[in-house]
């Protein structure tokens, strides 16, 4: 675990002609804020794809009013760092998107309006624990100067924050098999092993052998969903035994969501579901038009030509929310049965099945051939307590994935010559024979044993068996 930190140094006009107009005016004072989105790897991902490593929003900068006639200077910036915590290993290579947003503070109906001023993106290699890296990016006529670094949260160390350090138990050396933790030479590397069986999804540990549960889960291995129903009866069992949640101050208390947004708690914080026409962390963004690009993840914006008319986002499969901002985690419904692994491809769900099961949801037990387990049009045949594949012509192997030699079985009768063909095989018959497999003798008078030869085929011509 660790934190990616971003320090914005300046945002203003870039060098060269064509300085941009100031984003703020006496009539419309404004202030800036920034959003950073991180994704693992170096892939050229669309700006709309999810920020898999995390995202952060800065505080608002100081209010700025343009001086009439003056060129746009470097604009006043928010204080502090943008911090994106990451729970797992730091990937070493990452893609970033940094957006500069303008918040207009005029007396609009319904509060401040947001618009995107600039978006920069890049792909970088970065080791955790290293020094600040400086960068300059240009977006149109604007220039953004910033620094960034990734640092590990104790007890994690290393370039990926995967090694763990503990204070030494003895002053002189580390325990058997454990090395000193560079650069913290007074600490020792420690393998952090959670309690055996601790749920990888719902549990975590900060000390070896422990299993601490994320909110909403309980039990020694964090495998039991918290039940609130047993808390309702005043004479019911105590919360210590049932794992029921005792109400306390929650992140949704007082509803932090503005403009009629509804609040739901998440393991770490809260999430606002905004009514149409509003978005942002607390539904505070309004006055948005389709020109502002409010639909995320490839959503299609309809209507909303001016700030007074509402827009509608038509979301692509796999996304939902008034701005298509929420990824539908269809795998959380555990659609794959019998231990199958779920894969959400966006446009479809796929289940990877364990041995012995098949079908779109791994619902078929292959012992009884109920599932289609054979590739390339093969069919399943029962026998011996297991299934086998009877393969279509041209294929072989355990699941009909291997191309077979169609001539290997010598299918052409009466000395006919076999030729492999992309669609099957072709038999070139010896004189006196005809048919797909040269199985029919041609009578001396020229009539064949077949009722009639296909038009245009002379006896002895190669016959294709499809």
């Amino acid at each position: 675990a660790g934190v990616f930190e971003l320090q914005i140094h300046s945002f203003g006009p870039g060098p060269g002609p064509g300085a941009p107009r100031s984003p703020c005016s006496a009539r419309l004072p404004c202030r800036l804020f920034f959003r950073v989105c991180l994704k693992p790897g170096l892939s050229e991902e669309a700006a709309e794809s999810p920020c898999a490593l995390g995202a952060a929003l800065s505080a608002r900068g100081p209010v700025y009013t343009e001086q009439p006639g003056a060129p746009a200077p470097d604009l006043p910036l928010p204080d502090g760092l943008l911090q994106v915590p990451f729970r797992d290993a730091w990937p070493g290579t990452f893609s970033f998107i940094i957006e500069t947003w303008r918040e207009e503070l005029g007396d609009q109906i319904g509060g401040p309006a947001w618009s995107l001023l600039a978006r920069v993106a890049g792909r970088r290699r970065l080791a955790a624990g290293g020094p600040w890296a400086r960068d300059i990016q240009r977006a149109g006529a604007w220039e953004l100067r910033f620094s960034y670094r990734a640092r590990c949260e104790p007890p994690a160390v290393g370039t990926a924050c995967t090694r763990l350090c503990r204070p030494r138990s003895a002053p002189s050396r580390c325990g058997p098999g454990l090395r000193p933790c560079a650069p913290l030479e007074d600490e020792c590397e420690a393998p952090l092993v959670c309690r055996a069986g601790c749920s990888p999804e719902h549990g975590f540990c900060e000390q070896p052998g422990e299993c601490r549960c994320l909110e909403g889960w309980t039990g020694p291995l964090c495998t039991v969903p918290v039940s609130t129903s047993s808390c309702l009866s005043p004479r019911g069992p105590s919360s210590a035994t049932t794992g029921c949640l005792v109400p306390g101050p929650g992140p949704c208390d007082g509803n932090p969501c503005a403009n009629g947004g509804s609040c739901s708690e998440t393991p770490r914080s809260f999430e606002c579901t905004c009514p149409r026409g509003f978005y942002g962390l607390r539904c505070e963004v309004s006055g948005v038009t389709c020109a502002d690009g409010p639909c995320f993840n490839g959503g299609l914006c309809v209507g909303g030509a001016d700030p007074d008319s509402a827009y509608i986002c038509h979301c692509p499969p796999g996304f939902q929310g008034s701005n298509c901002e929420k990824r539908v985690d269809r795998c959380s419904l555990q659609p794959c049965r019998n231990g199958g692994l779920c894969l959400d491809l966006g446009h479809a769900l796929r289940c990877r099945c364990r041995a012995g099961f098949a079908g779109p949801r791994c619902e078929h037990d292959l012992d009884d051939c109920a599932g289609r387990a054979c590739a390339n049009g093969g069919t399943c045949v029962e026998g011996g307590g297991a299934h086998r594949c009877s393969c279509a012509l041209g294929f072989g192997g355990r699941d009909c994935r291997e191309r077979a030699d169609p001539c290997a079985a010598r299918p052409c009768a009466h000395g006919g010559r076999c030729y492999a063909h992309f669609s099957g095989l072709v038999c070139a018959c010896a004189p006196g024979y005809m048919g797909a497999r040269c199985e029919f003798p041609v009578h001396p008078d020229g009539a064949s044993a077949l009722p009639a030869a296909p038009p245009g085929l002379r006896p002895g011509d190669p016959q294709r068996y499809l």
């Epitope: 049965r337 692994l341 364990r354 099961f357 054979c374 590739a375 297991a386 009909c400 291997e402 191309r403």
Partner: antibody, heavy 120, light 111 residues
Framework: QVQLVQSGAEVKKPGASVKVSCKAS????????IHWVRQAPGQGLEWMGW????????EYASKFQGRVTITADTSANTAYMELSSLRSEDTAVYYC?????????????WGQGTLVTVSS | DVQMTQSPSSLSASVGDRVTITCKSS???????????LNWLQQKPGQAPKLLLY???KLESGVPSRFSGSGSGTDYTLTISSLQPEDFATYYC????????FGQGTKLEIK
């Protein structure tokens, strides 16, 4: 014909990294998991991890966590295994293997193996 | 992690003999889906391993019927009913119920 062809033998110094490739033919790696298994000289087999090339999901054996990275280039139909911070005990033959068309957890088809020697 | 212990680590036998190799897991290999994910593989010197049996007793395609598997819970057995010259090799059990763990191997040699 389903085939996995691995890159050639490597000699590395302790502390270095090695990246072994595994090129698939006869099937699309997006349809299957690619597993990596190693075998030290005269020793048994050791499972290292797998990748689901469809979405890049990986699972690693706890012993190699943090030191091994399995990746895939679906356009080249090739999987890769990178092992860092090499030590002499990492000298081994490294195999890639793939599951069957219908189940992700059977090691049915194997590469020919790549010998990695770690020596100062 | 699940431990797999094979026995014996080596054994000598003659062509025609009936041979049994056992594999013991540190915890049950019965999956919640009702299947038991225990495989047996064969490896000859200088070659990659080859899958023989899966799901305890199911023969992989092309494997002779003299190979059979049995067992449940934590105890499993590979039996070769009548040894052939090509069967002299090293045999490994592999569990895939809880990730993947190989046994340490049993080397089958000619007596």
């Amino acid at each position: 014909q389903v085939q996995l062809v691995q890159s050639g033998a490597e000699v590395k110094k302790p502390g270095a990294s090695v990246k072994v490739s595994c090129k698939a033919s006869g099937f699309n790696i997006k349809d299957d998991y690619i597993h990596w298994v190693r075998q030290a000289p005269g020793q048994g087999l050791e499972w290292m991890g797998w990748i689901d090339s469809e979405n890049g999901d990986t699972e690693y054996a706890s012993k190699f966590q943090g030191r091994v990275t399995i990746t895939a280039d679906t356009s080249a139909n090739t999987a890769y295994m990178e092992l860092s911070s090499l030590r002499s005990e990492d000298t081994a033959v490294y195999y890639c293997a793939t599951s069957s068309y219908w189940s992700y957890d059977l090691l049915v088809y194997w590469g020919q193996g790549t010998l990695v020697t770690v020596s100062s | 992690d699940v431990q797999m212990t094979q026995s014996p680590s080596s054994l000598s036998a003659s062509v025609g003999d009936r041979v049994t190799i056992t594999c013991k897991s540190s915890q049950s290999l019965l999956h919640s889906n009702g299947k038991t994910y225990l495989n047996w593989l064969q490896q000859k010197p200088g070659q990659a391993p080859k899958l023989l049996l899966y799901l305890v007793s199911k023969l992989e395609s092309g494997v002779p019927s003299r190979f059979s598997g049995s067992g449940s819970g934590t105890d499993y057995t590979l039996t070769i009913s009548s040894l052939q010259p090509e069967d002299f090799a090293t045999y490994y059990c592999l569990q895939t119920t809880h990730l993947y763990t190989f046994g340490q191997g049993t080397k089958l040699e000619i007596k």
